[in-house]
């Protein structure tokens, strides 16, 4: 029984968001799933051999804002996404890379083939 | 227009060594990285390894570590693969390939054959 | 190393017709894979990478999709000009590895 004047409203519990995860999984996960009160994330950038390589996985709510506002790093192409909408969102998100800058080109812009 | 241009044919006696070279037009050449493939018919492709034209670091498949050498000349935009102690294994296409995120263009293919 | 298995070598097709390459990875990869076309004679070409996303200029009839370790390249309304080898690669971890290919060939 609640005792007189005790709040009968539940206490806010941090939200539970299951994301999928590689590359950036806790030892502790099971088939690629972490878990956050924060945000999933996708990402994309170039690695050391200028491959488009992606990792994705959980950003907890503190900083997570920051993070995912995907500020440009001079020297660097990545980009990333965030969502909360649902478990595993980020299986859906689709980041792209930056173009890239105009004096990484001789003649004007590259043409694939 | 990015184009990789690489020597149509190179014939070799076994034992021998060969480089092979890759002139890179149409972009800065420092800016992508330069991959290796190797393509037997009938074998598929294999990866040899990557350099980075800007710092000359490298990257290599284990299998190529003793076979294969990655080199740039920047004045000439060029990049060159030694390939050392030739066998007939080693007779194969050989590409080179540049790359940069979402930009990936390929060589024109030299053709290795190591007979005596 | 991880192996990329295409384990159909061949698959037959119509013009007009759908077709899906398939490419299996012998551990998770994430997304990190591509697909190449080569024509006999001809260097490769890529056409995707992170496994959906297709390369500037590649027609939107080649679509890839797949995670983990099950990936497919779909040909929708197959052209004359799309018959050629096709590789998947992974690039999750070196040494980068390629599938054996898979040949399209007219019915």
């Known amino acids: 029984k609640k005792e007189d004047g005790e709040s009968t409203a539940p206490t806010p519990r941090p939200k539970v968001l299951r994301c999928k995860c590689h590359h950036h999984c806790p030892e502790d996960s099971v088939n690629n799933i972490c878990s956050t009160d924060g945000y999933c994330f996708t990402m994309i950038e170039e690695d050391d051999s200028g491959l488009p390589v992606v990792t994705s996985g959980c950003l907890g709510l503190e900083g997570s804002d920051f993070q995912c506002r995907d500020t440009p790093i001079p020297h660097q192409r990545r980009s990333i996404e965030c969502c909360t909408e649902r478990n595993e969102c980020n299986k859906d998100l689709h980041p792209t890379l930056p173009p890239l800058k105009n004096r990484d080109f001789v003649d004007g812009p590259i043409h694939h083939r | 227009q990015v184009q990789l241009q690489q020597p149509g044919a190179e014939l070799v006696k076994p034992g021998a060594s060969v480089k092979l070279s890759c002139k890179a037009s149409?972009?800065?050449?420092?800016?992508?990285?330069m991959h290796w493939v190797k393509q037997r018919p009938g074998r598929g492709l294999e990866w040899i390894g990557r350099?980075?034209?800007?710092?000359?670091?490298?990257k290599y498949n284990e299998k190529f570590k003793s076979k294969a050498t990655l080199t740039v000349d920047k004045p000439s935009s060029t990049a060159c693969m030694q390939l050392s102690s030739l066998t007939s294994e080693d007779s194969a296409v050989y590409y080179c390939?540049?790359?940069?995120?979402?930009?990936?263009?390929w060589g024109t293919g030299t053709t290795v054959t190591v007979s005596s | 190393d991880i192996v990329m298995t295409q384990s159909q070598k061949f698959m037959s097709t119509s013009v007009g017709d759908r077709v899906s390459v398939t490419c299996k990875a012998s551990q998770n990869v994430g997304t990190n894979v591509f697909w190449y076309q080569q024509k006999p004679g001809q260097s490769p070409k890529a056409l995707i990478y992170a496994a959906s996303y297709r390369y500037s200029g590649v027609p939107d009839r080649f679509t890839g999709s797949g995670s983990g370790t099950d990936f497919t390249l779909t040909i929708s309304n197959v052209q004359s000009e799309d018959l050629a080898d096709y590789f998947c690669q992974q690039y999750d971890s070196y040494p980068l590895t390629f599938g054996d290919g898979t040949k399209l060939e007219l019915r």
């Open positions: 390939a540049s790359r940069r995120g979402d930009i990936d263009v």
């Open positions: 350099i980075d034209p800007n710092s000359g670091g490298t």
């Open positions: 149409g972009y800065t050449f420092t800016t992508y990285w």
